[in-house]
């Protein structure tokens, strides 16, 4: 019989009081079967951290320092639930650290020496943690004490709880430095009103403060966030301008054998019968012999942490950068105002090696990072570990909702003026051999299918959205009779056609045979009934021009596309007889790395581009052989995008709205995790 | 395709030094970028340092200062001086020569680094 006992951590007397009311009530009102509570009782969250770690305890809940002290090893903990708080209509389980100026004062966040600054106290997370974390290497050397630092790098600020004896310009706008609220500048009303009044420049608090402070949006309208790139926007467009996103209050649990499913079935269960307004005799979020006793007296209720989120993503880029800035205090030497060299993520052991002969010719200009699948690469852009990488546009939408930009696209058709004119996109098609001629695109079902790869544009997202409009339901893998779609469940009926080997098998990446363009069709020249691609991969891979055994002798007449309307054409009137336009490629990064991927990819591309005529004696980034690795063999250059520097703008609003109507039949745990912090 | 041939390791105290050579069966002048790879046990293999045809080259952090790659087109061999060797040294070294086949696993057998402490 499992154990199914989560033991709770609790750091008090009132805590393990309130722990051991709450096992007896959950024994009340769940059968003997069901998940039950146990306390243990510790003298502090970092001796929770370690019991939870060492197996002698399974839940805490934690503010978002803590979870990141519980994150790093040897302790290894990941968060599994969310407090929220608002409504069960719009949960709010995440705040936005924010720095608030007024409107007129003309300054950005890399201008912010020698300004006034207010803060909601010393050591509090949005008005001191996270502001001077992300500001720690602009600040003045040495950065030892820190708050002596902070004082020299700032013309005055007031910062409460500080020591005004030992740094008296922090405590110069608010004399004093009172910790509590008789110091009118104390907390996040205190530091905004240290703002208002024209004491300070800017304040750090939460997005939620001016909200608090100002009920009327014309007196919200004189301020402004200041934004990481540098440039400033309204007050109400936080999610899109903060310093970071912070979550409120989670339970954390060990990565591995830590009874997530078990610690969600019991809070789900607690939620229902002692949450808000739900009983009188218990109440988990109360606590009447203390504050915030387990959790949160604020919140409303719990939300599962998806399962592809770790604690790093979870806390997101710029909060964990901050906090380790402030923990570990080491700067790059560098002078900042260049590039760091770019860290591509390469899909598998292929894309790695041209990768690394990337770097070597580079001379150090781009360094390489491997991962297995292309989510796993998204992943690593987004907490640091990588910084670039080119992405079909289905990953284009998938990067754009985990917060990562466009800031090149591949260009397909040569021109003078390649780099500056972006192009429309290409087609996305269904392509069968002509033998078949019976076969349409009314009398698919039961047909064996080849796809580039699930979440992909042309192999994934456009057919099966147009399929999902006409069977209305995800079960692809019954429509089809088999077929290969890399990234489907292994023991799905879409991977039974794969060839890979063992545990390739299926794998989105080049370890699997039929995975993208060229894999797809190989997939229908040797197995299948209809191949999802784009209109070039026929031509490139007959009439010789792949010299690969199974394709050296195919012929482009031997092949036809099926047409929406039910009837067929040659393969060259695809612009005729198309399912949809595709976005092209683009590469994606962070909003902070963005300058310098767009500074070094188009130093490289005038290096190693298609300027290179012969690619047998040098480097040539666009090409490997059919195999479109790292970029498609296809691409003319990378262009820059202009204003459609968004994943919105870049993919276009049709595009994006086929792909959230598919969002239903997402298996994208990624895309589920990135929903969770950004709904 | 040029055939590669691996040579030159050993048995070395750590500090030591030991020079291995790549030799191979047909020109390498022509050969945009030719490097060493390592790949200890239970590790992926991972690059050590490359040279391009121009005479470029590019090192792993984790060797820099210690390592020096060269080519000798005349003699068609890639070489890998290593200096103030470490324990953590310790692999089997290969070369490669990149060719356009980047998904074609050509390896050679390697020449097996042993660095004791």
């Known amino acids: 019989v499992p154990d199914k006992t989560v033991r709770w951590c609790a750091v008090s007397e009132h805590e393990a009081t309130k722990c051991q009311s709450f096992r007896d009530h959950m024994k009340s009102v769940i059968p003997s079967d069901g998940p039950s509570v146990a306390c243990v009782k510790k003298a502090s969250y970092l001796d929770c951290i370690r019991a939870i770690a060492a197996n002698e305890a399974d839940a805490v809940t934690l503010d978002a320092g803590l979870v990141y002290d519980a994150y790093l090893a040897p302790n290894n903990l990941k968060p599994v639930v969310a407090e929220f708080y608002g409504s069960k209509e719009d949960p709010q389980t995440f705040y936005y650290a924010v720095a608030v100026v007024k409107k007129d004062s003309g300054f950005q966040m890399n201008q912010l020496r020698g300004k006034k600054s207010c803060h909601t106290g010393l050591g509090r997370s949005a008005g001191w943690n996270i502001p001077i974390g992300l500001l720690y290497c602009d600040l003045p050397e040495p950065r030892k004490p820190l708050e002596k630092a902070v004082a020299n790098f700032f013309s005055g600020s007031c910062a409460p709880c500080a020591d005004g004896t030992d740094f008296p310009q922090l405590c110069q706008l608010c004399p004093g430095c009172g910790c509590s609220t008789l110091n009118q500048y104390f907390g996040y009303s205190g530091a905004f009103k240290c703002l208002k009044d024209g004491a300070g420049d800017v304040a750090f608090v939460k997005h939620s403060t001016i909200f608090e402070n100002l009920a009327n949006k014309a007196d919200r309208d004189q301020y402004e966030l200041l934004c990481l790139d540098n440039t400033r926007k309204p007050v109400d467009e936080y999610k899109d301008c903060h310093l970071a996103q912070v979550p409120s209050h989670t339970v954390v649990a060990r990565s591995m054998g830590g009874k997530e499913d078990l610690i969600w079935e019991l809070l789900n269960q607690a939620q229902e019968h002692f949450g808000k307004d739900k009983s009188k005799e218990f109440q988990l979020f109360s606590s009447p012999h203390g504050k915030d006793l387990l959790f949160k007296d604020s919140a409303h209720g719990f939300l599962k942490v998806p399962p592809r989120m770790d604690a790093k993503m979870y806390l997101g880029y710029e909060y964990v950068t901050a906090i380790r800035n402030l923990r570990e205090g080491t700067c790059p030497e560098a002078p900042t105002d260049e590039c760091k060299p770019v860290k591509w993520c390469a899909l598998s052991h292929h894309e790695r090696l041209k990768c690394d002969e990337w770097s070597v010719n580079s001379v150090g200009k781009i360094e390489c990072v491997s991962a297995e699948t292309t989510e796993d690469c998204i992943a690593k852009i987004m907490n640091g570990e990588a910084d670039a990488m080119s992405l079909d546009g289905g990953f284009v939408y998938i990067a754009g909702k985990c917060g990562l930009v466009p800031v090149l696209a591949e260009n397909y058709n040569k021109s003078d003026n390649c780099e500056d004119t972006p192009e429309a996109g290409y087609f996305a098609i269904a392509v069968v051999k002509k033998s078949a001629s019976d076969l349409t695109w009314d009398n698919l079902k039961g047909k064996k299918s080849c796809h580039t790869a699930v979440g992909r544009t042309a192999g994934w997202n456009i057919p099966m959205g147009l399929l999902y409009n006409k069977i209305n339901h995800c079960r692809f893998d019954e429509f089809f009779s088999e077929g290969c779609a890399p990234g489907s469940k292994k023991d799905s009926s879409l991977c039974k056609l794969c060839m890979g080997s063992g545990l390739n098998l299926c794998e989105p990446n080049n370890k699997e045979g039929y995975y993208g363009y060229t894999g797809a069709f190989r997939c229908l020249v040797e197995k299948g009934d209809v191949a999802f691609v784009k209109h070039q991969t026929v031509p490139q891979n007959t009439g010789g021009k792949n010299p690969d055994p199974w394709a050296k002798n195919l012929n482009e007449k031997d092949y036809e596309l099926l047409c929406l309307d039910g009837t067929r054409k040659p393969v060259e009137e695809y612009a005729n007889c198309h399912l949809a336009r595709a976005p092209n490629h683009a590469v994606v990064t962070r909003k902070d790395k963005e300058a310098c991927v767009h500074k070094i990819l188009r130093q490289q591309q005038h290096l190693f581009g298609s300027n290179v005529t012969d690619c047998s004696g040098n480097f040539c980034l666009f090409r490997s052989e059919t195999k479109d690795l790292l970029f498609r063999d296809d691409t003319v250059c990378l262009a820059k995008l202009h204003d459609r520097n968004t994943y919105e703008k870049y993919l276009g609003e049709e595009y994006v709205k086929a792909v959230g109507n598919l969002r239903k039949c997402s298996t994208s745990s990624l895309l589920e995790a990135c929903t969770f912090r950004r709904p | 395709q040029v055939q590669l041939v691996e040579s030159g390791g050993g048995l070395v105290q750590a500090g030591g030094s030991l020079r291995l050579s790549c030799v191979a069966s047909g020109s390498i002048a022509s050969i945009a970028t030719m490097a060493w790879y390592r790949q200890a046990p239970g590790q992926q293999r991972e690059l050590v340092a490359g040279?391009?045809?121009?005479?470029?080259?590019h090192y792993a952090d984790s060797v820099k200062g210690r390592f020096t790659i060269s080519r000798d087109n005349a003699k068609n061999t890639l070489y890998l001086q290593m200096n103030s060797l470490e324990p953590e040294d310790t692999a089997v070294y290969y070369c490669?020569?990149?060719?356009?086949?980047?998904?074609?696993?050509?390896w050679g057998q390697g020449t097996q680094v042993t660095v004791s402490s």
């Open positions: 040279i391009t045809r121009g005479g470029s080259t």
């Open positions: 490669t020569d990149y060719s356009r086949r980047y998904y074609e696993d050509y």
